[in-house]
Structure formats: C-alpha cells, structure tokens
C-alpha cells in the first residue's frame, strides 16, 4: 500500500473495498486520506493494520 | 486552496504550557490527517503525533508522549497542539500538515 | 524506529545541471518515501511521495526513484528557485521519521 507497514492503531473489523482513487491518495505520512469507516485498501497500510 | 493559517510565535517561560492552532481551508477538513512536526533551530524534522479530524483517533512519537496533546475542533476546521512542561528542548518551529500541504509554522520560544 | 540517512548535507551545482540527493532508511520501507524542499524561511513543500509519484503542481524535471533502503531525488535542470534544502521521509511504520536533509546551493 501506498503508506507502508504496520501502525498501532485498532480500527472497525466490518471493512468493505474502497474505490480505486482512495487507494492511489496520498500516503497517510503526508497527511493524506483518513480511512472510510467501512473501507478497506488492502493489506499493508499503516492506517490499515491487520488483526492484532 | 488550500491553506494552513498557523497561530503567532509564542514566547513562555520553563515549565508553562502553550497550546498553538492551525486553521485549515479549501478541502475537506475531516477527510485527511492532519500532522504536527518538530523542526528545532533549522534542522531537521520530526513528527510529532497525527491525528484522524474524523473520529479524533490520535497517534504519538513515542518521544512527544505526554509532551503533547493534539485536538481538532471540526466546527471550525482548526486543530491544535498542547505542549506541557516546557523545558528549553521546546524552544523549535512547529508546523502543521495536512492533504500534503504545510502551514508557515510557529516559533516557540522558551526562556525565563 | 527507522533511521533516515541523507549523508550529503549540503552540495553546490551550477544552474542547468543535474542534481541527484540520495537517502537511505535503516529497514526495507517498500517504496514508503516521500521527498520535501524546504526553501531558505519559506514554506515546507511535498514534491515526491510514494518514491516517484509527483506531487500536484510540482515541476516535471523533479523526480524520484528508489527500492528497497535506497531512494533518490532528481533535479533534471537545476533552476535558481530550486535552492533549498530537501528532506526525505518514510512512510512505512510509526513514527514517520526524516532524513537530516540536503542543502542545495547554486555556484
């Protein structure tokens, strides 16, 4: 993902797949998108830890 | 545009608190994090925390735990920074950054 | 944390050259980086994230490559408003560290 590895954070369990031009956004280390709620942009993201 | 409008320079004496604040237009406030970073005498960089405007989640450098705190007001589209304690080590620039765009920052001075 | 190394702190070129700032991180960071210039008491700038994806607005003869621990910034044709200094950045794992940055000066 465009953010890189692991961040400790939890985030909601119920993810769906978010469109195409969230995924290409700006990393979240330059102050890019928050995750939609019910969103999910692949494994990898700092903002997207897998399960603890 | 957007814009990240940074409060004035701030001078405080060791062992106050300063609270700065960054006033963000031209997007949408609560779709982006918005950072704080460290820059002490023109040298390099160091981020501080982020916070997600959305659902307030916070996220620390471990070294600016308990120094500072990090807020956002979404009526206002304005997120701030807490710094508790100052000691001399906090006499820096500190900016904040959101959507990839950075305010003009904020000295911070700390003397007696 | 993961270290970031920029071991050039300054360099001086001339006008029309080809500038090239090397950064290395401590860890494999996939690609995480991001690039910053940082103008003489002006505002901090994102030029590059993702390695080699160019920020809105920013000039084509910027550019950035890199795998692995090693990345790059290229200036193709060195301009007087580029003089500034450049950070490097990893995106991979918290915290977000920078590298020391590189000064670019104009001969």
């Known amino acids: 993902g465009l953010a890189g590895g692991s961040a400790q954070s939890q985030r909601a369990p119920d993810r769906v797949l978010c469109h195409s031009g969230q995924q290409q956004g700006l990393p979240r280390a330059a102050g890019g998108s928050v995750p939609h709620p019910r969103c999910h942009c692949g494994a990898g993201r700092a903002d997207w830890p897998g399960p603890p | 545009e957007v814009q990240l409008q940074q409060s004035g320079p701030e001078l405080v004496k060791p062992g106050a608190s300063v609270k700065m604040s960054c006033k963000a237009s031209?997007?949408?406030?609560?779709?982006?994090?918005m950072m704080w970073v460290k820059q002490s005498h023109g040298k390099s960089l160091e981020w501080i925390g982020d916070?997600?405007?959305?659902?307030?989640?916070?996220s620390y450098n471990q070294k600016f735990k308990g120094k500072a705190t990090l807020t956002v007001d979404k009526s206002s589209s304005t997120a701030y920074i807490q710094l508790n304690s100052l000691t001399s080590e906090d006499s820096a620039v500190y900016y904040c950054?959101?959507?990839?765009?950075w305010g003009q920052g904020t000295l911070v001075t700390v003397s007696a | 944390d993961i270290q970031m190394t920029q071991t050039t702190s300054s360099l001086s070129a001339s006008l029309g050259d080809r500038v090239t700032i090397t950064c290395r991180s401590s860890?494999?960071?996939?690609?995480?980086l991001n690039w910053y210039q940082q103008k003489p008491d002006g505002p901090v700038k994102l030029l590059i994230y993702?390695?080699?994806r160019l920020h809105s607005g920013v000039p084509s003869r910027f550019s950035g490559s890199g795998s692995g621990t090693d990345y790059s910034l290229t200036i193709s044709n060195l301009e007087q408003e580029d003089l500034a200094t450049y950070f490097c950045?990893?995106?991979?794992?918290?915290?977000?560290?920078f590298g020391g940055g590189t000064k670019v000066e104009i001969k």
């Open positions: 950054a959101s959507k990839a765009y």
């Open positions: 031209g997007y949408t406030f609560t779709d982006y994090y």
């Open positions: 916070i997600n405007p959305n659902n307030y989640d916070t």
């Open positions: 860890q494999d960071i996939s690609n995480s």
């Open positions: 993702s390695t080699s």
């Open positions: 950045q990893q995106g991979h794992t918290l915290p977000w560290t």
